[in-house]
């Protein structure tokens, strides 16, 4: 595949939102462990948003690991829910507006700023670092750009980007979402390249929002973000079809990722189908 | 005018428990966050934690997670602390303060209750 | 979490004189979640300065604030005798929300 390629990636209009998870493990990478034996085993795939089969070598390993299907869908997903988006052109803000807040499963607590829909404001909010979802903001001023209502109805800025220091690339200075976009995918997606703690300089990927790609970057070895792949093609297929652009009636379009200051109004309804 | 009055001094024996009261006038009760501080000598200021009493959210200090309980009565528009386990390092000057949804300045403070842990 | 040393413990100043009161955190705080409180003797602390620099209602405007990252500071350009209290400073950018030990500013 080519870049080019990539850039022309078209997905179906049933892409989840951003994942919300029940237990931490559920996010954990499947780990056959350092044994040898062949035993049929379940994890949860954060990718997939399923449960799905494994090897497992019979030692070590981690809590994604299920004996059962159904053990594996009742720890990690939510009701057996899947959720739907439906697109319209009446009303005002993007549909993660109206998801709760969410710490998501870190402990690096930081304030961040959601949409609270009982209030119709933005207010700060405690963020454990990562996951969680995408009513979440680091100013105030970029919730309320995109959350609140605005005296002439709904405004969104354009998406600023920022040369990142660290490893001279583009970056998006924050999660917000440009105008005619929307983005479905695992919202870490949408963080800027972080280096972390430590001091190695592993390679590795991120997905650069800005421009639509998975880049290269140094990883120190410890800290850092779930914005963080071993190798371009993980980072396409966890972060790259998450993007898309639509049309009047939830179409969909081709598209570069060349962006200008739009206005738009958009309505979502959430739609809750029982898996049957 | 917006007031935060606090209960009155408290003297408890280790291991006990005590529960602190701060009630809020002047200004929408549900629509700002309640923290609690403490003040001790050796310590300086500690931020307990903060509840919303609209939708309850509260979050707490992990060092006082275990111990320390806060609550809030919409009806009377009071907020309560609760701090359990009682040790000698807990004797404090415990101060609620309010602050806005969207930031920590700490407006308006209550006049403090000490708690004084003695056996 | 994050640690706000204040330095010095103590500053003896003359009214008249410029106060400088320095606060250092463990890690970068943006600024605009670094605040400054005072407090006198007998009373809770009173909001002096928000995001770094942004006087609260009724500071005087020989207060300033400046500073970024980790190093934040509060002057006062000439000391008037009511000046002379304890300041704290504080950070909500990480929790738990901590406050520095405190500046105690006396009279010389």
């Known amino acids: 595949d080519s870049e080019e390629d990539e850039e022309h990636t078209i997905i179906t209009d049933t892409e989840l939102p951003p994942l919300k998870l029940m237990h931490s493990f559920c996010a954990f990478k499947a780990d056959d462990g350092p044994c040898k034996a062949i035993m049929k085993r379940f994890f949860f795939n954060i990718f997939t948003r399923q449960c799905e089969e494994f090897i497992y070598g019979g030692c070590e390993g981690n809590q994604n690991r299920f004996e059962s299907l159904e053990e594996c869908k009742k720890m990690c997903t939510r009701d057996n829910a899947n959720r739907i988006i439906k697109t319209t052109l009446q009303q005002e803000k993007p549909d993660f507006c109206f998801l709760e807040e969410d710490p998501g499963i870190c402990r690096g607590y930081i304030t961040r700023y959601f949409y609270n829909n009982q209030t119709k404001q933005c207010e700060r909010f405690k963020y454990g670092g990562c996951l969680g979802n995408m009513n979440n903001f680091e100013t105030l001023e970029e919730c309320k750009n995109i959350c609140e209502d605005g005296p002439n109805g709904f405004q969104v800025d354009n998406y600023g980007t920022q040369l990142n220091a660290v490893n001279n690339s583009l970056t998006p200075q924050s999660t917000k979402v440009p105008s005619l976009f929307e983005f479905h995918g695992p919202s870490w997606c949408l963080t800027p390249a972080d280096r972390g703690l430590c001091r190695a300089n592993e390679n590795r990927f991120y997905y650069n929002s800005v421009i639509g790609k998975c880049r290269p970057f140094k990883y120190s070895g410890c800290g850092g973000n779930e914005n963080n792949f071993t190798s371009k093609q993980e980072c396409l297929r966890a972060c790259k079809k998450g993007f898309i652009q639509r049309i009047s009636k939830g179409g969909l379009i081709k598209t570069k990722r060349k962006r200008k200051k739009q206005r738009v109004k958009i309505a979502y309804e959430e739609i809750f189908v029982k898996n049957m | 005018e917006v007031q935060l009055v606090q209960s009155g001094a408290e003297l408890k024996k280790p291991g006990a428990s005590v529960k602190l009261s701060c009630k809020a006038s002047?200004?929408?009760?549900?629509?700002?966050?309640m923290h609690w501080v403490r003040q001790t000598p050796g310590q300086g200021l500690e931020w307990i934690g903060e509840?919303?009493?609209?939708?309850?959210?509260?979050n707490y200090n992990e060092k006082f997670k275990t111990r320390a309980t806060l609550t809030a009565d919409k009806s009377t528009s009071t907020a309560y602390m609760e701090l359990s386990s009682l040790r000698s390092e807990d004797t404090a000057v415990y101060y609620c303060?309010?602050?806005?949804?969207?930031?920590?300045?700490?407006?308006?403070w209550g006049q403090g209750t000490t708690v004084t842990v003695s056996s | 979490e994050i640690v706000l040393t204040q330095s010095p413990a103590t500053l003896s100043l003359s009214p008249g004189e410029r106060a400088t009161l320095s606060c250092s955190a463990s890690?970068?705080?943006?600024?605009?979640?670094l605040y400054w409180y005072q407090q006198k003797p007998g009373q809770a602390p009173r909001l002096w300065i928000s995001g770094t620099s942004i006087l609260a209602s009724g500071v005087p405007a020989r207060f300033s604030g400046s500073g970024s990252g980790t190093k934040y500071t509060l002057t006062i350009s000439s000391l008037e005798p009511e000046d002379f209290a304890v300041y704290f400073c504080?950070?909500?950018?990480?929790?738990?929300?901590?406050f520095g030990q405190g500046t105690k500013l006396e009279i010389k």
């Open positions: 303060a309010r602050s806005s949804v969207v930031d920590v300045a700490m407006d308006y």
């Open positions: 504080h950070q909500w950018s990480h929790y738990p929300f901590t």
């Open positions: 890690s970068s705080v943006s600024s605009s979640y």
């Open positions: 509840i919303k009493p609209d939708q309850g959210r509260i």
């Open positions: 002047g200004y929408t009760f549900t629509s700002y966050w």
